[in-house]
């Protein structure tokens, strides 16, 4: 099919982060075409010679795929026709981090957009009361983080207080020798207060809250990826 050199189609990507060992998504959308057979999707990675993935004429074309991505990539084939060129990346590796290009060719024209993909490890923290300790103590644990994060404690009652003197944080390397288990202990905890354990690296920020009263303990945690922008 003919491609007008004057018309470039809009391609949009979103910076994202991958959790190593898990599956990730590299997001990319484009102006859709009416015929699937007229759409070509190429994913490239800066510094890599072969393609990350190619989809053309309605199916994967992997003859030029780089070895480091073999068997680990897929597009959402049924969504290509509506303009979704996102790439699923299986078993994310630390070395998958970098700059990617989503390159689209349709009968309307061509377009491309870059995205920064960060890789690391991040997990939800869980905060518990440590009943084995001699004083009232909280224990914050998160199983997988990389790179090494910072851990900060905060409390609702003592807002702005610095808990670094009454807390102790340790990092234990996991069996795969990359990610680490984060354990932070907060001492001298008072009752009827809400404490927050905040774990953060350049990829993600996670918070574990615990509300301790005489009658009950309430927990809540959430995780937010950083620097994810269009």
């Amino acid at each position: 099919f003919g491609i007008s050199g004057r018309h470039s189609i809009t391609v949009t990507t979103v910076a994202s982060a991958g959790n190593i060992g898990e599956d990730g998504i590299l997001s990319c959308t484009f102006e859709p075409d009416i015929k699937l057979s007229d759409i070509v999707i190429q994913w490239l990675k800066e510094g890599v010679l072969g393609l990350v993935h190619e989809f053309k004429e309605g199916k994967d074309e992997l003859s030029e795929q780089d070895e480091m991505f073999r068997g680990r990539t897929a597009v959402f084939a049924d969504q290509v026709i509506v303009g979704n060129a996102s790439l699923r990346l299986k078993n994310v590796q630390l070395t998958d981090a970098g700059t990617y290009k989503c390159y689209i060719i349709t009968s309307k024209g061509k377009g491309n957009a870059n995205l920064e993909y960060k890789t690391g490890a991040f997990s939800m923290p869980e905060v518990n009361v440590d009943y084995n300790a001699s004083s009232e103590t909280l224990r914050c644990e998160a199983p997988r983080w990389f790179p090494q994060p910072t851990v900060v404690w905060a409390s609702q009652v003592d807002q702005g207080a610095n808990f670094s003197e009454v807390s102790n944080t340790s990092f234990e390397l996991n069996s795969e020798n990359v990610t680490m288990k984060v354990v932070s202990v907060l001492y001298n905890v008072t009752i009827n207060n809400t404490y927050s354990c905040m774990i953060e690296n350049d990829i993600a920020k996670a918070t574990g809250d615990i509300k301790v009263t005489e009658s009950e303990i309430k927990r809540r945690s959430h995780l937010q990826l950083l620097n994810s922008k269009a």
């Epitope: 003919g2 491609i3 050199g5 490239l44 510094g47 890599v48 070895e67 480091m68 491309n112």
Partner: antibody, heavy 117, light 105 residues
Framework: EVQLVESGGGVVQPGRSLRLSCAAS????????MNWVRQAPGKGLEWVSA????????YYADSVKGRFTISRDNSKNTLYLQMNSLRAEDTAVYYC??????????WGQGTTVTVSS | SYELTQPPSVSVAPGKTARITCGGN??????VHWYQQKPGQAPVLVVY???DRPSGIPERFSGSNSGNTATLTISRVEAGDEADYYC????????FGTGTKLTVL
């Protein structure tokens, strides 16, 4: 400032070997794939070889396959081209160039290789 | 293997527009890059991805790519534009065009 500086060129007899170097500065060398491109006297540009940022992947032009080896030392920010079994037709200015997606965005000034008996 | 064909020479008067073509089978499906090379100097990228310009390259340089032909257009040609121009695509390696000598009359 991004810079590429080639060295190692010279006059060599047919059948002999030569190793070219390209010192890179001003960017994170290991993040970028690199190329060698040559230009015979009075002729056009001819791509020779490419190497991935990590050094694990390499491509060669048919004209040099089996004779030339591209490599890199990311700790030294240096690209190499080992040229064996040199022929008269390998006489050229050799440029190293940084790969940018499907093209090349930065070139060195070139080093001259003359294969002559 | 993939081949790119350029006219050996193009002549243009100062202030006029020069067009240098690059022919290749279904080249419109590929990303085309253009390099300028002055005598005794290394090539310089002037247009990438068919029509984008690197920083520092004048707006007078533009590109298009359709069907079987990509075109480098230099408007308001100056004496300093006299050089060899090469188109290039990637096809499991860098493929260069045969080169075009631009002469400013």
């Amino acid at each position: 400032e991004v810079q590429l500086v080639e060295s190692g060129g010279g006059v060599v007899q047919p059948g002999r070997s030569l190793r070219l170097s390209c010192a890179a500065s001003g960017f994170t060398f290991g993040d970028r794939a690199m190329n060698w491109v040559r230009q015979a006297p009075g002729k056009g540009l001819e791509w020779v070889s490419a190497i991935s940022g990590s050094g694990s992947g390499t491509y060669y032009a048919d004209s040099v396959k089996g004779r030339f080896t591209i490599s890199r030392d990311n700790s030294k920010n240096t690209l190499y081209l080992q040229m064996n079994s040199l022929r008269a037709e390998d006489t050229a200015v050799y440029y190293c160039a940084r790969k940018r997606w499907y093209g090349m965005d930065v070139w060195g000034q070139g080093t001259t290789v003359t294969v002559s008996s | 293997s993939y081949e790119l064909t350029q006219p050996p020479s193009v002549s243009v008067a100062p202030g006029k527009t020069a067009r240098i073509t690059c022919g290749g089978n279904n080249i419109g499906m590929k990303s085309v890059h253009w390099y300028q090379q002055k005598p005794g100097q290394a090539p310089v990228l002037v247009v990438y991805d068919d029509s984008d310009r690197p920083s520092g390259i004048p707006e007078r340089f533009s590109g298009s790519n359709s069907g079987n032909t990509a075109t480098l257009t230099i408007s308001r040609v100056e004496a300093g534009d006299e050089a060899d121009y090469y188109c290039q695509v990637w096809d499991r390696g860098m493929i260069f065009g045969t080169g075009t000598k631009l002469t400013v009359l």
